[in-house]
Amino acid sequence: PKQTLPKPIIRAESTYMVPKEKQATLCCQGSYGAVEYQLHFEGSLFAVERPKPPERINGVKFHIPDMNSRKAGRYSCIYRVGELWSERSDLLDLVVTEMYDTPTLSVHPGPEVTSGEKVTFYCRLDTATSMFLLLKEGRSRDVQRSYGKVQAEFPMGPVTTAHRGSYRCFGSYNNYAWSFPSEPVKLLVTGDIENTSLAPTDPTFPDSWDTCLLTRETGLQKDLALWDHTAQNHHHHHHHH
């Protein structure tokens, strides 16, 4: 069997949801000593980067200029050390947002509910789209989908304090082209005092894996980075359409 290097990790810097005409940044974390990284889009070569000096850098950033629906889709990366190529990374789905119109998000029975109540979000967009997406702030990878002609509903069932937080919705014109985001709706779930004080609240910062962790080698960093790479390849997960 042909020998290959371990697959790199591909990430979007800050977010995989990129407003149209803005620049996206993807990171490919490979290995110290890699002389070339390649970014592939829908199976075709999109960009090349050759780090300098290769032995001091464990990954590269790829900038995707002027984001639009023709550059939204599935990206992957590979790297080379000498003549030996790595396996392909997992696929990363890059989405263009701020296309066309803005939906309206509402919640029933209201934004302030008690623990155990049934809650439903409604996302409405009058232009032609059939798929709607609901995202919770700080949980952008956990996308809920629903379908409808101009409105979709997202039944949450009986809520707990874990459902507290800010929500936005999008209309989707295809898997990779989304509308402007709705205005946020903040859901406040109150429980009894004991539950509320112990209930974990979701972080409002972006997902931790939506961050580039590229390093320059100094001393022990090479060993640490190798451990980090192996661990993250083992635990890394990403959303699928």
Epitope: Q23, T25, S44, A47, E49, K61, H63, K71
Partner: nanobody, 127 residues
Framework: QVQLVESGGGLIQAGGSLRLSCVAS????????MGWFRQAPGLEREFVAG????????YSPDSVKGRFTISRDNAKNVLYLQMNSLKPDDTAVYYC????????????????????WGQGTQVTVSS
């Protein structure tokens, strides 16, 4: 946006050399990663060579590697493609393209990465 004008094409014997130029008007080319593509009749547009904003890094596919060399002169706002050992298969319209990018070092190989295109210059290699 940047206006791009190619020149240097023509009819050449197999084995000969040509140098294509691409001049950018108005905006400074230092803001752009650049590339050369070609399109033969009835075929898809094909990537031929790419160069980073700084000019430090270049990339070409195997089909032209060792024969075609891309370079740039940012002071003069010109992109070049030196084509040696030309073959009849190299006959095509050659286009230069520019991609406004934050990256000083990325090289783009995909048509969709490029926002600005020239009108093209015809290269015909006779046997």
């Amino acid at each position: 946006q940047v206006q791009l004008v190619e020149s240097g094409g023509g009819l050449i014997q197999a084995g000969g050399s040509l140098r294509l130029s691409c001049v950018a008007s108005e905006r400074s080319l230092t803001l752009y990663a650049m590339g050369w593509f070609r399109q033969a009749p009835g075929l898809e547009r094909e990537f031929v060579a790419g160069i980073s904003r700084t000019g430090d890094t270049t990339y070409s596919p195997d089909s032209v590697k060792g024969r075609f060399t891309i370079s740039r002169d940012n002071a003069k706002n010109v992109l070049y493609l030196q084509m040696n050992s030309l073959k009849p298969d190299d006959t095509a319209v050659y286009y230069c393209a520019a991609s406004a990018t934050y990256s000083a070092t990325n090289i783009y190989t995909h048509q969709r990465a490029y926002g600005d295109w020239g009108q093209g210059t015809q290269v015909t290699v006779s046997s």
